[in-house]
Structure formats: structure tokens, C-alpha cells
Interface confidence: low
């Protein structure tokens, strides 16, 4: 911690400027006060000050707000963010989607630190649920992020959001996230017609279970291998040939290369043999 | 949580066939999710997979022991069972049933339980 | 079936080592790549899972990486309950082998 000490005379910081990068982190301490340093926060980021000066302006807003700081302070910390810690952090109120947005923006390009989950946690848990601006907000900063989140925390995305989320966004989700997200992203794109809704729903088709995709096997809509490799193997044993068939459409070639793994070879154990061979595909039950 | 408990006879004379279960506590054997193993450590070696069984009673074996292992699952009693027929001194090992999920990882294991062939 | 070559086989450490463990596959098996540890009298531990993806609860100074048929386990500073034997998985095709093991000793 740094000194108290009485600040020279003359060096009294009227305003937050450039002059003050050539202050020593005790001048910077003693010299600049609190309440003038929250009230020019947008200010700190055009000047160039050392990781050591920020410390000193950090430790002087921490003595000012010690129950954390104030939404108004928060949205202009600008790179001074990267010096919190998820325990400063936990005591902040953030409300708006403009401040949120703010601090993703000086970690934007990194992957997502222990003080930005805790401010995600923090934002999200204020507005109750997982809205569709912020989620727009968080997959644009961070295409991973729906798939971080537990199938608990996943339950209060409302199906409005699910508009928001794209294909890549679920990349790395799990069945159990899938399961929560799929009954969501049905609702959302039910007044759909066809072709335009089996383009939305595919990337969520992994929580499918058996009579959706039966029903799909019904309209034509050609899913590709990718997309059937990702389906619930509970949910692929009930399909019949003909269903798989017309699910894959002229995609069913594929099945011969992906025989040997799941969940096409738990399929096609469960199928007679005179069926698959209708296949014309040499596939051995 | 899950856990996974091995049982079955610790001793098995030659050419006999050796028979263990696997009890799911904690969760549902039933899971559409998840894949039951049984998976095998000689002492002092490697661990070699021996198959699995889907709850709708599919089951996968691994080619080299595939003439001689049966795995079933009963679902009432949330357990499912390795038979492996003809055994010999090389299928002295400790036995694990384990948990694997749709990425093809064994996330949870029994304890193990050791079994000697000998006569 | 496809192979699961680790190496070395064992090798000696000391705390604070950044230790690095490589499996080779016989064939292409996508990122289809587990690792395991292993204490004795214990059954093995899933660390790794989808070649870099590390499972809930293993701390953060286990990573792997690699795709194809070369794979890496690294711990980047080993610690006294690292010391065990480290496996390698194949869940690509349905033989599910697993490599021979790397033993990672005190040095």
C-alpha cells in the first residue's frame, strides 16, 4: 500500500490530464483526489498511465467507494477494469447493457477472465433472465458463452432470445444444455414455415427427441451428416430405415462412412438387416 | 452425484465363466445420455476396454474378446452385468464398470474390484 | 483397430516441472482424444476429454491439445498429487483403446 504522504506544493491536480503520467505513484496518491478522479473517470483512458499508476488510482477509488463503486464510475473504468479482481467486482450493480458492453470491449480478443464471468454473473442476475440484448451483447463478445452456462442457468433464457444465437454459438454445447435449449428454440421458430424453420432449428437438433425427428423426416429438409451425428442417440434408435431415409435425403450416403460411430452404428443395430439393405449402402447390422 | 459399485466372486477357476455387476446409485441407467462399460487392468499393465450397453440393451464389444463377453442391463434394478466365458490365467485383472458419456469419455468409475483365475 | 502409442513411457519430475506427455493414434481420429490419470489402488480419473477440453473440477494447469493422430497432455507446473500414470483414449472407432500409459515419477 502506498504512503501517506502531503502532496509538494504547487502539484495539487486540479483536473485529470496528461500531466499527471510524470507523478509518482505516493504523488499520484497524495495529489489527486477521489472524488474529482470518479467524477473524470472517461478521461483515464486517453492517458497513457503505467500498470504501477493505475494501481494508485484503483487503491483511491477503493477507499472512496469501499461498498464498490457506482454504475457511473463502472462505465468509464476502461482499462483501469483489468485491474479488478472478481471480489471488487461482486459488489458492483450493474444495470445497463451500455456499461456491460463498455468493459467487454478492453478484453474484447481474450478469452473470458475470472473478473468478466463474475461481471456477466452479475449483470445477468440483476435483470433476472437472460434477455435477447444481452444475449446478442455476450455471443458477439464471446461466441462460447450459452454453452458455458449449466442447464439450470440455461432454463431462464426466455424463447425471445433464442432469436439472438447463432450456429456457432452452440459449438460446444453438450446434450444437457441442448435438451434445455431445444423446447425453447422450437417455441421460438413454431410459426416458421418448412424450409425456413428446419434452417433455424437444426443447430438446436441435438435436444431433438424421437417424434420431432420423425416429424422432419416428413417435410423433405435433406439434414446433413454433421447434423445427425450431433442427435440424441436415445433419440435416432427409435427411427425406422425409411425415416433415417428421408431425413438424410440424398445425405444418406454418408451414413457408410460414419458406420462405425455412434450414434449410426447404435442405429444400425437395432435395424434389420433386409432393411438396411434397401440402403443399397453394403451398412451390416 | 453418481457413483458406480462393482460385485461379483473375487476367485474363478479356469475355463468357468466369470460374472460381475455394476450398481448405479445417484443416477438412472435408463439416461438416454450415457454409455455403461466395463473396462479391465491386468497387474501392472494397461487398461483394455471390454464393451458397453445402451439402456435400450444395444451393446458394443471390443473385437478381441467379442466371442466370449456378454453384457446385459437391468433397468428395474439400475444395474447392468459383465459375463465373460472360458476365462484363463490372462483374464486375471481388476474389472471397472464405468459411466461414458456421447463425447466417448468415461467420466465416472467404480472402485474396481479384483479378479483371479486361478484353480 | 486403431493404436494408441504413448510416450515416454515414464519419466521423472520435479515440482514446478512443466511436464509434457505426447499419445500418437495409427489413424486420423479427428479430436476424438481422452486422458486419464491414475493413482495406484485407484481407479483412473477422466482429466481431458475431446482432446483439449478439461472436464469439470481438474485444475486449470491440465491442458491437452492436437487433432489428427498427434495429440499433447501438458501439466504446466507439476504438483505432489500429479505423480501417477497418465492415459490416452480413443473413443473414434468402436475398439476404444487406450495408450500404453506414461508414469510420471519424483525426480
Known amino acids: 500500500e502506498v504512503e501517506k504522504t502531503a502532496c509538494p506544493s504547487g502539484k495539487k491536480a486540479r483536473e485529470i490530464d496528461e500531466s499527471l503520467i510524470f507523478y509518482k505513484k505516493w504523488e499520484l496518491e497524495a495529489c489527486v483526489d477521489a472524488a474529482l478522479l470518479a467524477t473524470q473517470m472517461d478521461r483515464v483512458n486517453a492517458i497513457p498511465f503505467t500498470y504501477e499508476q493505475l494501481d494508485v488510482l484503483k487503491h483511491k477509488l477503493d477507499e472512496l467507494y469501499p461498498q464498490g463503486y457506482p454504475e457511473s464510475v463502472i462505465q468509464h473504468l476502461g482499462y483501469l477494469f483489468l485491474k479488478m479482481s472478481p471480489e471488487d467486482i461482486r459488489k458492483w450493480n450493474v444495470t445497463s447493457l451500455e456499461t456491460l458492453k463498455a468493459l467487454l470491449e478492453v478484453n474484447k480478443g481474450h478469452e473470458m477472465s475470472p473478473q468478466v464471468a463474475t461481471l456477466i454473473d452479475r449483470f445477468v442476475k440483476g435483470r433476472g433472465q437472460l434477455d435477447k440484448d444481452t444475449l446478442d451483447t455476450l455471443t458477439a463478445f464471446y461466441p462460447g458463452y450459452l454453452c458455458s452456462l449449466s442447464p439450470e442457468e440455461l432454463s431462464s433464457v426466455p424463447p425471445s432470445s433464442i432469436w439472438a444465437v447463432r450456429p456457432q454459438d452452440l459449438d460446444t454445447c453438450d446434450p444437457r444444455q441442448l435438451d434445455v435449449l431445444y423446447p425453447k428454440a422450437r417455441l421460438a421458430f413454431q410459426n416458421m414455415n418448412g424450409s425456413e424453420y428446419f434452417v433455424k432449428i437444426q443447430s438446436f437438433l441435438g435436444g431433438a427427441p424421437t417424434e420431432d425427428l420423425k416429424a422432419l423426416s416428413q417435410q423433405n429438409v435433406s439434414m446433413d451428416l454433421a447434423t445427425f451425428m450431433k442427435l440424441r442417440t436415445d433419440a435416432v434408435l427409435p427411427l425406422t430405415v425409411a425415416e433415417v431415409q428421408k431425413l438424410l435425403g440424398p445425405h444418406v450416403e454418408g451414413l457408410k462412412a460414419e458406420e462405425r460411430h455412434r450414434p449410426v452404428r447404435d442405429w444400425i443395430l437395432r435395424q434389420r438387416q433386409d432393411d438396411l439393405d434397401t440402403l443399397g449402402l453394403g451398412l451390416q447390422g | 452425484q453418481v457413483q458406480l459399485q462393482e460385485s461379483g466372486p473375487g476367485l474363478v477357476k479356469p475355463s468357468e465363466t466369470l460374472s460381475l455387476t455394476c450398481t448405479v446409485s445417484?443416477?438412472?441407467?435408463?439416461?438416454?445420455?450415457?454409455?455403461w462399460s466395463w473396462i479391465r487392468q491386468p497387474p501392472g499393465k494397461g487398461l483394455e476396454w471390454i464393451g458397453y450397453?445402451?439402456?435400450?440393451?444395444?451393446?458394443n464389444y471390443n473385437p478381441s474378446l467379442k466371442s466370449r463377453v456378454t453384457i446385459s442391463v437391468d433397468t428395474s434394478k439400475n444395474q447392468f452385468s459383465l459375463k465373460l466365458s472360458s476365462v484363463t490365467a490372462a483374464d486375471t485383472a481388476v474389472y471397472y464398470c464405468?459411466?461414458?458419456?456421447?463425447?466417448?469419455?468415461?467420466?465416472?468409475w467404480g472402485q474396481g474390484t479384483m479378479v483371479t483365475v486361478s484353480s | 483397430d486403431i493404436q494408441m502409442t504413448q510416450s515416454p513411457s515414464s519419466l521423472s519430475a520435479s515440482v514446478g516441472d512443466r511436464v509434457t506427455i505426447t499419445c500418437r493414434a495409427s489413424?486420423?481420429?479427428?479430436?476424438?482424444l481422452n486422458w486419464y490419470q491414475q493413482k495406484p489402488g485407484k481407479a483412473p480419473k477422466l482429466l481431458i476429454y475431446?482432446?483439449?477440453s478439461l472436464q469439470s473440477g481438474v485444475p486449470s494447469r491440465f491442458s491437452g491439445s492436437g487433432s489428427g493422430t498427434d495429440f499433447t497432455l501438458t501439466i504446466s507446473s507439476l504438483q505432489p498429487e500429479d505423480f501417477a500414470t497418465y492415459y490416452c483414449?480413443?473413443?473414434?472407432?468402436?475398439?476404444?483403446?487406450f495408450g500404453g500409459g506414461t508414469k510420471v515419477e519424483i525426480k
Open positions: 489413424q486420423s481420429i479427428s479430436s476424438y
Open positions: 483414449q480413443q473413443p473414434y472407432d468402436a475398439s476404444y483403446t
Open positions: 445417484g443416477g438412472s441407467v435408463s439416461s438416454g445420455s450415457y454409455y
Open positions: 450397453i445402451y439402456y435400450s440393451g444395444s451393446t
Open positions: 464405468a459411466r461414458e458419456g456421447k463425447n466417448g469419455a468415461f467420466d465416472i
Open positions: 475431446a482432446a483439449s
